[in-house]
């Protein structure tokens, strides 16, 4: 899950074990190359962050639904 400890930007070191409903999400960012592993951080409608594995099909589908433009976390 996102971790700001000892890294220059938010990074995900573990992923959510739940497949979140798409309707609960409003946006996403892709973590930067400075992070040890690539990850997607979804933001929920309640303003919370959820880490997800970009290799999973549902994550890829959600990213398409939330916007085709690439979203990369700024550092």
């Amino acid at each position: 899950q996102p971790d700001a400890l000892n890294v220059p930007s938010t990074c995900c070191f573990t992923f959510s074990s739940k497949k979140i409903s798409l309707q609960r999400l409003k946006s996403y960012v892709i973590t930067t190359s400075r992070c040890p592993q690539k990850a997607v951080i979804f933001r929920t409608k309640l303003g919370k962050e959820i880490c997800a594995d970009p290799k999973e099909k549902w994550v890829q589908n959600y990213m398409k639904h939330l916007g085709r433009k690439a979203h990369t976390l700024k550092t």
Partner: antibody, heavy 119, light 107 residues
């Protein structure tokens, strides 16, 4: 496996401030995506959500208690804390700390600590 | 705040019975509902999230359904270890609200 453990005084006098601490083990409290919550349960009653804190220090408090509560985080000790001021007998309850992974589901709980407000 | 109303407040059933608990929200909450089990003297345990998804490790005899304002929690074949109080919780809005609980006893 993340575990949570509450600690604090079991007895508090009316009008005083209640302070409780939740110690996180088996994982870093600094990990984002984890939201650290306080929830209480009055004797024989249901559950009442108090509020949460995020690793960044962002908080959200239940408006019904907002004027009396503060939730803080100490990443160096892997702990987060609740303070509740001006307590009355109505604040007598079991206080739980709990984690949610950003998905608004409390999947890990402490065992709870009973706090009695009495003179 | 959203009000969550559970019914019944208590019920008694026999081992093997199908048990149903309902939870009604005071406004539309889509499927933003969790169910918890709390055994005496213990902390609550998450059973179901998003109204119908079983949490990892939870027996398949537990299930949930519903959306909008009306939700149902079902135990298909009641076991002695299911004796507990069950709570619903909404997360459509902050602050989160819980139902008042349903206490389940064995006949």
């Amino acid at each position: 496996q993340v575990q949570l453990q509450e600690s604090g005084p079991g007895l508090v006098k009316p009008s005083q401030t209640l302070s409780l601490t939740c110690t996180v083990s088996g994982g870093s409290i600094s990990s984002g995506g984890n939201y650290w919550n306080w929830i209480r349960q009055h004797p024989g009653k249901g559950l009442e959500w108090i509020g949460y804190i995020y690793y960044s220090g962002n908080t959200y408090y239940n408006p019904s208690l907002k004027s009396r509560i503060t939730i803080s985080i100490d990443t160096s000790k892997n702990q987060f804390s609740l303070t509740l001021s001006s307590v009355t007998a109505a604040d007598t309850a079991v206080y739980y700390c709990a984690r949610d992974g950003g998905d608004d589901a409390f999947d890990i709980w402490g065992q709870g600590t009973m706090v009695t407000v009495s003179s | 705040d959203i009000q969550m109303t559970q019914s019944p407040s208590s019920l008694s059933a026999s081992v093997g019975d199908r048990v149903t608990i309902t939870c009604q929200a005071s406004q539309d909450i889509s499927n933003y509902l969790n169910w918890y089990q709390q055994k005496p003297g213990k902390a609550p345990k998450l059973l179901i999230y998003d109204a119908s998804n079983l949490e990892t490790g939870v027996p398949s005899r537990f299930s949930g359904s519903g959306s909008g304002t009306d939700f149902t929690f079902t135990i298909n074949s009641l076991q002695p270890e299911d004796i507990a109080t069950y709570y619903c919780q909404e997360y459509n809005n902050l602050p989160y609200s819980f139902g008042q609980g349903t206490k389940l006893e064995i006949k």
